[in-house]
């Protein structure tokens, strides 16, 4: 009689990435008779929640139902019936969260309480929302990135299963950018980890890891533009700000009491006789870049060297992986190629910034304006914290690779933090099985 | 030293307005959340309204909301209340007091209050 | 609103003996219950943060325990200036405080 294949014995896990500025549900999926293989847990699903960030509920707790609703229901269909119960479900807050909490403990554990009653609502497992740190962001993404180029496999490949796979296990480095936060993490060359708080050490498949991560609080894009901005207008003589990181011609209005309505701008706060003032866009890369230049503070290092704000850096060692809105902003200036050097990246920034708003409008129709308007800006600093924060040069930027997804899963620290809540990443290397015989019957 | 002085309490007609302040010194004043807190002659102490560090929350007591607006100028570390419609249950000794912080993290408690400043709403 | 309910209202206490107050919120707070003595014509004054961490310069006699909807402050031993009025607050929802107790020393 002919082999027929059996029900796939498949599981489902779920996590909730509530960023800062928006929040998105990933769905993965990997067969159960291989959890601890390395490698088969794969992205089946993203859906991206309508609407802001958890953190800017705080004065509307009771919306957050009907907000995470959308997102959960298509879980529901993505997932199959018989197996809702089974499916763990996992929120992980990040910056933004601990940014209100810094505002206000009471006012995040309200947040997350509510968080956590609307997801307990649905068939699945859930298993609790929670504020990660940025220490867990960093190495999350870390292992995310790692495990899905197969850095952690102990069979040496003939072939590359991406583009920038090397085939040597040396783990990649994890660049991350957020909206409030960004992390850097990877395993220094014979270093020793100056400052506790930066030090991790891993154990998996086997093997030991020791990892530098520090997540800077404040430094993600939108919280950086903020601080940009409460920085500037100290010193504008008057409600009009011309901003060399908006393109020309672009004018928009800001309220005071918005510049100041996180602790990001708090070292910038005064009084200005102005309720409200204008950006007035003026478009020039090199003055965008001086003026991101005065959010780092690289005059004092207690180390053999720093990043910037006193926070021990070692030297950086191998590649590196840059994801989240590393590519998507590199990808919107389609300069993600391995091909585009720094110096090219750069030539090109400049003359992104330098053109017209009302040709940048026409140019890219379909972009919402609020975005668009932010590019100049968000490239700007990418180009200013690898360079000068991270101290990436032109030479070792051939090792950046912009990441937006490996093999169908999107690169970030959700992964990893399922993995490691599932338990899927065994510390010792698993005995290896003969090929499993319950495929056929 | 932590120092809390609140003033422009008074005599007023019900219908009326007034404003009150409080000028703050000794801590950095932009990195806590204040408050305001009332006392009516012999009873117990009643919340009023929250200003949060950074202005993310803002709130009032159900008794004063539409008619009281809390404001701050970090910097002339003053907290303001603006009461409007006053009314004669409004009559109370009224506390400026400052948010605790757990650890890091900022707290919904009390940890400093000033001596207070007395609103009559009388005809 | 949460509603916190305080027991006794009043109490009389011998110096070096115990006194316990108790608080009951009409819905879970977490451990977000904080305790204050007032004294005549003073303002309040922060005893116990977040259920049981002791404010500074408060006297390790005061102590506070208890978690959810059930919370108690303990002054252990008492002594007379003790004499006040104490209150609990809850911070989980828009602040609200109990009613009051007051202590006399005997």
């Known amino acids: 009689t002919q082999n027929k294949a059996l029900p796939e014995n498949v599981k489902y896990g779920i996590v909730l990435d509530a960023g800062s500025s928006h929040t998105s549900l990933y769905i993965y999926k990997w067969p159960a008779e291989k959890e601890n293989d390395t490698g088969v847990v794969h992205q089946v699903e993203e859906c991206r929640v309508k609407g802001p960030g958890i953190s800017k509920f705080v004065q509307k707790v009771n919306e957050i139902g009907i907000y995470l609703t959308d997102c959960m229901e298509r879980a529901r269909e993505v997932i199959p019936r018989s197996q809702h119960q089974e499916t763990p479900v996992y929120l992980g807050a990040t910056a933004g969260m601990r940014l209100l909490r810094m505002e206000s403990e009471e006012l995040a554990d309200r947040v997350l309480d509510v968080v956590e009653r609307s997801l307990s609502n649905y068939p699945f497992d859930f298993q609790g929302a929670r504020i990660i740190t940025g220490q867990e962001e960093g190495a999350y993404g870390w292992i995310t990135i790692n495990y899905l180029l197969g850095k952690f496999s102990q069979k040496t490949r003939w072939f590359s299963i991406v583009p920038y796979e090397t085939n040597n296990q040396e783990t990649f480095g994890a660049l991350d950018l957020g909206g409030a936060s960004t992390q850097v993490t990877f395993v220094p060359q014979n270093q020793t980890i100056e400052s506790p708080d930066n030090a991790l050490q891993f154990r998996l498949y086997g093997k030991d890891y020791n990892v530098y991560t520090h997540s800077f609080l404040c430094y993600g894009k939108d919280q950086a533009l903020w601080q940009k901005l409460a920085k500037d207008i100290q010193v504008a003589s008057n409600e009009i700000l011309r901003d060399p990181c908006f393109h020309p011609g672009y004018k928009k209005v800001v309220n005071v009491s918005d510049l100041y309505k996180t602790p990001c701008t708090k070292r910038f706060e005064m009084t200005l006789p102005f309720q409200q003032f204008e950006i007035q866009g003026i478009g020039n890369y090199q003055q965008c870049h001086q003026s991101i230049l005065e959010l780092f503070n690289t005059s004092y290092c207690p180390y053999s060297q720093c990043a910037f704000n006193g926070i021990f850096l070692p030297p950086l060692q191998g590649d590196f992986g840059a994801f989240s809105a590393f590519y998507f902003v590199m990808k919107f200036l389609n300069l993600t190629s391995e091909k585009v050097s720094q110096e090219k990246v750069t030539e090109m920034m400049k003359k992104f910034c330098a053109q017209p708003w009302e040709e940048i409008k026409t140019s890219y129709a379909g972009v919402k304006e609020k975005y668009l308007s932010e590019y100049c800006f968000s490239g700007t600093y990418i180009l200013s914290l690898l360079l000068q924060g991270y101290h990436f040069t032109a030479d070792s930027w051939e090792h950046i690779h912009f990441i937006g997804k490996i093999q169908g899963s999107d690169a970030g620290w959700t992964l990893g933090y399922m993995l490691n809540l599932t338990n899927m990443i065994p510390a010792e290397q698993p005995l290896s099985t003969p090929l499993s015989h319950s495929t056929y019957v | 030293e932590v120092q809390l002085v609140e003033s422009g309490g008074g005599l007023v007609q019900p219908g009326r307005s007034l404003r009150l302040s409080c000028a703050a010194s000794?801590?950095?004043?932009?990195?806590?959340?204040m408050n305001w807190v009332r006392q009516a002659p012999g009873k117990g102490l009643e919340w009023v309204s929250s200003?949060?560090?950074?202005?993310?929350?803002?709130s009032y007591a159900d008794t004063v909301k539409g008619r009281f607006t809390i404001s701050r100028d970090n910097a002339k570390n003053s907290l303001y209340l603006q009461m409007n419609s006053l009314r004669a249950e409004d009559t109370a000794l009224y506390y400026c007091?400052?948010?605790?912080?757990?650890?890091?993290?900022?707290?919904?408690?009390?940890?400093?209050w000033g001596q207070g400043t007395m609103v009559t709403v009388s005809s | 609103d949460i509603v916190l309910t305080q027991s006794p209202a009043s109490l009389a206490v011998s110096p070096g003996q115990r006194a316990t107050i108790t608080c009951r919120a009409s819905?879970?707070?977490?451990?977000?219950m904080h305790w204050y003595q007032q004294k005549p014509g003073q303002p309040p004054k922060l005893l116990i943060y977040?259920?049981?961490n002791l404010a500074s310069g408060v006297p390790a006699r005061f102590s506070g325990s208890g978690s959810g909807t059930d919370f108690t402050l303990t002054i252990n031993p008492v002594e007379a200036d003790d004499t006040a009025n104490y209150y609990c607050?809850?911070?989980?929802?828009?602040?609200?405080f109990g009613q009051g107790t007051k202590l006399e020393i005997k």
């Open positions: 607050q809850q911070s989980w929802n828009d602040p609200t």
């Open positions: 819905e879970g707070v977490k451990s977000y």
């Open positions: 200003f949060s560090s950074s202005s993310t929350y803002i």
């Open positions: 977040k259920a049981s």
């Open positions: 007091a400052r948010h605790g912080r757990y650890g890091g993290y900022g707290g919904f408690y009390f940890d400093y």
């Open positions: 000794g801590f950095t004043f932009n990195n806590y959340g």
